[in-house]
């Protein structure tokens, strides 16, 4: 029979993607770098179905995703179009709130305790989720 590609150990398969869920917290940039070293990226949510899957695995815990507006417009880390894509913001969000007293606004998106999205200060140490395409998961990494 044909060989079936599998996700790496400790990664969870769903709809032709592999996901890894952290148990500790990092700032968004450090979480982003962690996923890049895995030859993966912070999770990019493209459907309600994927939203429910991720939400089920992370529980009611603030968790970074691969969405930010650090350079102006909101962008997904894998280039998925933000404007036409799936969104699940909390009411009144994103608000780029400056009242937190940490300097600057809020440029990184995370899942909140109910799964809906909020923008927050990128330096906060939240959990994170890495994602990679299943076909890519079994391939050798690119030469860097």
């Amino acid at each position: 029979g044909s060989e079936r590609t599998c996700c790496p150990v400790n990664w969870v398969e769903h709809e032709r993607s592999c996901y890894w869920f952290s148990r500790s917290g990092k700032a968004w940039a450090d979480a982003d770098n962690y996923c890049r070293l895995e030859d993966a990226h912070l999770v990019v949510v493209t459907s309600w179905e994927e939203q429910k899957f991720v939400q089920h695995h992370i529980g009611p815990v603030n968790t970074w995703m691969g969405l930010h507006d650090q350079n102006g417009p909101w962008k997904w880390v894998d280039g998925t179009d933000y404007e036409t894509g799936f969104k699940n913001w909390r009411p009144e969000q994103p608000d780029d709130w400056y009242g937190h007293g940490l300097g600057g606004g809020e440029d990184c998106a995370h899942f909140t305790d109910d799964g809906r999205w909020n923008d927050d200060v990128c330096q906060r140490p939240y959990r994170w989720v890495c994602e990679t395409e299943l076909d890519k998961a079994s391939q050798e990494p690119p030469l860097l």
């Epitope: 990664w11 990092k26 030859d39």
Partner: antibody, heavy 123, light 107 residues
Framework: EVQLLDSGGGLGQPGGSLRLSCAAS????????MNWVRQAPGKGLEWVST????????YYADSVKGRFTISRDNSKNTLYLQMNSLRAEDTAVYYC????????????????WGQGTLVTVSS | EIVLTQFPDSQSVTPKEKVTITCRAS??????LHWYQQKPEQSPKVLIK???QSFSGVPSRFSGSGSGTDFTLTINSLEAEDAATYYC?????????FGQGTKVEIK
């Protein structure tokens, strides 16, 4: 207290094998990539290999590619370096080192490098 | 491969003097440049990470600056215990590389 404890060094024969270990404690091991760095006697530091946090991806210096294998057991909080086809030029102190985060705020006394383990390759 | 070149190779300095060590990268590495101190028979210690981030517990006389290709480690008011070899290291891309080291001796 955060610690990295290197072990497994010793005398290896040219063409032979050794396996180094690095036992980690005091931090969430699978949340960090890990590295091996070596230092030949009287020389500078040389990066050897890096493994991603989950172990999914590995990276090697050209000088050890195809001979050395980095791996990790996250259930045991341990990093490994399997050294095969040893050469005289592999003689060095080998250090394991934790990947540094930009925003990490480790407490005082934290040392992201092991104490080193000496590998001597000689017949 | 990104080559890191340190200046000077060695330096003999009087206590309380200011020491400046530079590290030049052969291509842009952003802020992914780290500084280590190594004393004889000891493992390297992190001084500065990501060009300018002071590492926990490191004396305030050590500071780092720069981005892109040019970086500087500064030791304000050198102390006798600072006699060591200092290395820069880039984590921007693989293969990761180190500078050749700068040996600081006390006069």
């Amino acid at each position: 207290e955060v610690q990295l404890l290197d072990s497994g060094g010793g005398l290896g024969q040219p063409g032979g094998s050794l396996r180094l270990s690095c036992a980690a404690s005091g931090f969430t091991f699978d949340s960090y990539a890990m590295n091996w760095v070596r230092q030949a006697p009287g020389k500078g530091l040389e990066w050897v290999s890096t493994i991603s946090g989950t172990g999914r991806r590995t990276y090697y210096a050209d000088s050890v590619k195809g001979r050395f294998t980095i791996s990790r057991d996250n259930s045991k909080n341990t990093l490994y370096l399997q050294m095969n086809s040893l050469r005289a030029e592999d003689t060095a102190v080998y250090y394991c080192a934790k990947e540094e985060d930009y925003y990490d705020s480790s407490g005082p006394g934290f040392d992201p490098w092991g104490q080193g383990t000496l590998v001597t390759v000689s017949s | 491969e990104i080559v890191l070149t340190q200046f000077p190779d060695s330096q003999s300095v009087t206590p309380k003097e200011k020491v400046t060590i530079t590290c030049r990268a052969s291509q842009n590495i952003g802020s992914s440049l780290h500084w280590y101190q190594q004393k004889p028979e000891q493992s390297p210690k992190v001084l500065i990470k990501y060009a300018s981030q002071s590492f926990s517990g490191v004396p305030s006389r050590f500071s780092g600056s720069g981005s892109g290709t040019d970086f500087t480690l500064t030791i304000n008011s050198l102390e006798a215990e600072d006699a060591a070899t200092y290395y820069c290291h880039q984590s921007s891309s693989f293969p990761r590389t180190f500078g050749q080291g700068t040996k600081v001796e006390i006069k």
